[in-house]
């Protein structure tokens, strides 16, 4: 299936050019998406090209500027947030990145009624997180690990917590491991639907071991970065959840929400909080051994001024074949009765599907079914449920949006997106206005991305929000590679792959092959999305074939494939890449003397193990910021898939699955090892240990470090990195510069 046909015609051939590395590094062919910032059922905000904040009313067709670029520029604002009562806007400036999601910033409050910034009781700086209440214009913010509340922007703040301490106690924001591996947010506080209550998490990192690394900077002495970071088997953060009445917080104070007894009996995690009504909240908890999750629905007791979580409202989700959930345990989407909910979890056949839970999980009604997976529930209204899945035409790497009518019986299902722009669009996400009156569809490919606005009742397209015309024009004279997504059937395992082929691909010729691998649990690399990136260039200009393969452990194809890697990371992921390479060789157009593999992060781990597999298949390979031993990585992630590194649990496989244990096997391959010295996520320690093992084994290898760079190797390091890797591969494949 050729998903992105080359635009080469003989008459035009001489005017067309290949992609260059410069194109990629300059982002020449990057695309835009349009996500409306919904503020009601029929209105949204959008930042225009000239930086005005514009309010659009779909029904009247009118738009007007609510905040001028001049006001934005006056405080160098890079972001904004309108209060729900539309009286104020916060302006965010001095953005300073911390970890993946977290950052600090300076906030200014602009009063729309008088066109002036609020003076008096200004916010302190820098703030770690700030948000409006869902109704009105109360503000909650986190400063120096403590939470503050303002009844109005010009009011003085009420301090809710007092125990916040850098690297010790985190209130309303997650610590490193919760941010990266559990919540995937920069915040850990949640307003109730009408702003009556504020729930927040407190993370106590007092007993967590600290990772320390040098940040070289420009000073005479490097400074040391210290992060409480629990590695596999180490002491974990202690989490508590509190809820405070935001109207009169001084009387009752923050009330702790009780942890279910079956969870509290041993180490546990808090995984998410969902408000149902102002007086009902749903908390999800997870045992440290992450195969048991408990969803607990708690009610406010007016007489006690506290939160009651009856055992009858505890719902247990357990996996007997792997860990609970996919990458994360799914979150519930509550229906209008405020007690029943929809949730994605494995059905009896081992496929993740939508279930409706009214009383107990055992009595759950399955809403979707089939040998495919429901991926996300976007919205539940009185009569419809909108979700995404990869059902259509049995391609796991696609995403289409479906609507199930839940108001009628039996419920009927309609694919909203399947036939809209079938060739261009096979991978969608959606963004819904209040009550799903309208929604935006964002198509990511395989063709050029396009964002459209739709009527939530009829699904009719109202207008195109962004169609990337400039990109389309710019690509007209570019020889893009061909892409195909197909599958291999091997020993009852289906291996989906994406192959990126040079523009003038000829099956009778031989091409060098580069495998790009990630391969982490619950990941997916083979997706029907548009991209013009480094591997596009390698195919277009350097004539390489690039392949991405989703092997065992990857997502959205059922639990059999997903949980195959449970407790034995580093085995089947590698085997399946090798199996795929052998199949590719059998196709006849691969030069088997010129095969390479590369990956980043988990992909760096897999590529390293593949190179050290002793198969002789790979001539060379690159590992960027690889994990080298699961004992070095974060507890929450690692233990989910590997259990604990203890003798009575899974220590043996922790030891067997290291890259260092295979140092000898690197002797016959060219290996390029790359890492940032300030990687807070996969610590430089991982590559340092690989290098040490290779030196001790007297194995030659190449290495590159990036001083003061984190896991993303951003900025100028990106250019250097891809230039360096390109030289390495061209040398490996004997391609002239």
């Amino acid at each position: 299936i050729v998903l992105r046909p080359s635009r080469v015609h003989n008459s035009e051939e001489n005017t067309m050019r290949a992609l260059t590395l410069k194109d990629i590094l300059n982002g020449t062919f990057s695309y835009k998406t349009f996500f409306p910032n919904w503020i009601s059922g029929q209105e949204y905000l959008h930042q225009s090209a000239d930086n005005n904040i514009v309010l659009y009313n779909i029904e009247t067709g009118q738009s007007y500027t609510i905040l001028s670029n001049r006001t934005m520029k006056s405080v160098n604002a890079s972001n904004y947030g309108l209060s729900p009562d539309r009286q104020f806007v916060y302006l965010e400036s001095d953005y300073s990145k911390l970890w993946r999601y977290s950052y600090t910033a300076t906030y200014y409050i602009y009063d729309l009624s008088n066109g002036e910034f609020v003076r008096g009781n200004e916010l302190p700086r820098p703030i770690q997180y700030l948000c409006w209440s869902p109704v009105g214009s109360k503000l909650a913010y986190v400063y120096q690990n403590n939470i503050y509340l303002k009844q109005r922007p010009g009011d003085p703040p009420f301090q809710i917590t007092f125990n916040g301490r850098e690297n010790k106690i985190f209130n309303g924001i997650p610590d490193w491991v919760y941010e990266e591996e559990m919540l995937a947010t920069k915040y850990a506080l949640w307003w109730s639907p009408n702003g009556k209550f504020l729930a927040y998490a407190e993370f106590n990192d007092t007993d967590i071991p600290v990772i320390a690394y040098s940040y070289y900077g420009d000073e005479q002495y490097p400074r040391t970065i210290n992060i409480p970071y629990p590695k596999a088997g180490a002491k974990n953060p202690v989490v508590r959840i509190f809820i405070i009445d935001t109207t009169y917080p001084a009387y009752v104070g923050p009330q702790e929400v009780p942890v279910p007894a079956m969870i509290a009996s041993s180490d546990y995690y808090f995984s998410w909080l969902t408000w149902v009504t102002d007086e009902r909240v749903c908390l999800q908890w997870l045992k440290r051994v992450q195969n048991v999750s408990v969803l607990s629905i708690c009610d406010f007791r007016e007489d006690w001024q506290t939160w009651d979580c009856p055992k009858t409202q505890e719902h247990i989700e357990e996996s007997r074949t792997g860990w609970a959930g996919g990458f994360f345990v799914s979150t519930p989407v509550f229906s209008y009765d405020a007690i029943s909910y929809y949730k994605i979890f494995s059905d009896k056949d081992g496929y993740k599907h939508i279930h409706y839970i009214k009383d107990t999980v055992e009595n759950a009604i399955q809403i979707t079914s089939g040998k495919w997976e429901a991926i996300n529930i976007f919205r539940v209204t009185q009569d419809s449920l909108f979700y995404s899945s990869n059902e259509f035409e049995e391609y796991p790497g696609r995403r289409n949006i479906y609507r199930i009518s839940i108001g009628s019986y039996p419920p009927s299902k309609k694919c909203v997106t399947c036939h809209l722009r079938k060739e261009r669009c096979q991978y969608y996400t959606a963004s819904f206005s209040d009550y799903a009156k309208y929604y935006a569809l964002v198509c990511y490919g395989p063709g050029i991305p396009i964002s459209t606005l739709h009527d939530g009742r009829t699904d009719q397209e109202i207008k195109i929000l962004e169609e990337n015309k400039e990109l389309e024009n710019a690509l007209k004279n570019i020889q893009l590679p061909k892409e195909e997504i197909k599958k291999l059937e091997v020993d009852e395992i289906t291996l989906w792959y994406k192959m990126i082929l040079p523009p003038q691909f000829d099956r009778s010729k031989k091409y060098p092959l580069l495998i790009q691998v990630y391969g982490g649990p619950c990941s997916q690399s083979v997706r029907s999305v548009f991209a013009v990136n480094w591997i596009s260039y390698l195919a277009s200009k350097e004539g390489m074939v690039i392949a991405l393969v989703d092997g065992r452990g990857t997502a959205f194809q059922g639990d059999k494939l997903l949980y195959a890697v449970y407790r034995k990371l580093g085995v089947y992921e590698v085997e399946d890449q090798i199996t795929a390479v052998r199949k590719f060789i059998e196709m006849g157009f691969i030069d088997e003397k010129r095969i390479a593999i590369w990956g980043w992060s988990y992909g760096g781990y897999v590529s390293s193990l593949a190179l050290a597999s002793g198969t002789g298949l790979f001539k060379c390979g690159i590992a960027v910021a690889p994990v080298s031993s699961w004992e070095y990585y974060a507890s929450v992630y690692t233990e989910r898939f590997m259990g604990l590194p203890t003798k009575d649990d899974n220590l043996e496989h922790y030891k067997n699955s290291t890259v260092m244990a295979r140092a000898e096997y690197f002797r016959n391959v060219d290996y390029l090892l790359i890492h940032g010295t300030a990687d807070d996520n996969v610590h430089f320690q991982n590559s340092a240990q690989i290098a040490k093992a290779l030196v001790n084994a007297q194995v030659d290898f190449q290495a590159m470090w990036y001083s003061d760079q984190n896991h993303g190797l951003s900025g100028l390091s990106t250019n250097h990195l891809y230039t360096h890797m390109t030289h390495f591969l061209k040398q490996c494949f004997s391609l002239s510069d």
Epitope: N121, F158, T247, Y251, V252, G253, E256, W304, Q305
Partner: antibody
Framework: EVQLLESGGGLVQPGGSLRLSCAAS????????MSWVRQAPGKGLEWVSA????????YYADSVKGRFTISRDNSKNTLYLQMNSLRAEDTAVYYC?????????WGQGTLVTVSS | EIVLTQSPGTLSLSPGERATLSCRAS???????LAWYQQKPGQAPRLLIY???SRATGIPDRFSGSGSGTDFTLTISRLEPEDFAVYYC?????????FGQGTKVEIK
């Protein structure tokens, strides 16, 4: 009906110690924040200390920090204030009050006199 | 800390008269964090008003509170004999919570 009954006051020498108790009834004690507020003879009210329902969080006025310890026993519905290194300026009627930083119910108070 | 200054120190009035008590804060205090208490000789304080203007349970409607920012007022529309007492304002916004020095309402 909410009732708070303080006890344990009395005469103590400077540098001495005293433990005040407050027996609570008429409401669910365990989740409630509780406080101690004092009133020197003929003077105004001064907040002294507060404690969360679980006892996990405690708060003190600077004037007593390091000398006074607030605690509670939820099984006995009782609030305590352990007062060490007492000074003449600690002489006051000590009230037990329900609330964190504002107080909807108060006890009758117990008099603490620090004098040599 | 936030200092609350009450005035007058003493208010001498007859039963049936209107009493107006003032409380001024050294810095702005949101209404939600301002309370008034009544204390009679030998008794514990009693919550009268919370949130600057909301009457606590069982408090007669002759008691009313108003104000915002730094200036707050407690008004007793018609003094009853049992209303002669000391009245304290209290803020719970700043930490630590603080009280005014009190206004004594005495019989003229």
């Amino acid at each position: 009906e909410v009732q708070l009954l303080e006890s344990g006051g009395g005469l103590v020498q400077p540098g001495g110690s005293l433990r005040l108790s407050c027996a609570a009834s008429g409401f669910t004690f365990s989740p409630a924040y509780m406080s101690w507020v004092r009133q020197a003879p003929g003077k105004g009210l001064e907040w002294v200390s507060a404690i969360s329902g679980s006892g996990g969080s405690t708060y003190y006025a600077d004037s007593v920090k390091g000398r006074f310890t607030i605690s509670r026993d939820n099984s006995k519905n009782t609030l305590y204030l352990q007062m060490n290194s007492l000074r003449a300026e600690d002489t006051a009627v000590y009230y037990c009050a329900k609330g964190w930083r504002a107080f909807d119910y108060w006890g009758q108070g117990t008099l603490v006199t620090v004098s040599s | 800390e936030i200092v609350l200054t009450q005035s007058p120190g003493t208010l001498s009035l007859s039963p049936g008269e209107r009493a107006t008590l003032s409380c001024r804060a050294s810095q702005s205090v949101s209404r939600n964090y301002l309370a008034w208490y009544q204390q009679k000789p030998g008794q514990a304080p009693r919550l009268l008003i919370y949130g600057a203007s909301s009457r606590a349970t069982g408090i007669p409607d002759r008691f009313s509170g108003s104000g915002s920012g730094t200036d707050f007022t407690l008004t007793i529309s018609r003094l009853e004999p049992e209303d002669f007492a000391v009245y304290y304002c209290q803020q719970s916004l700043g930490y630590p919570p603080t009280f005014g020095q009190g206004t004594k309402v005495e019989i003229k």
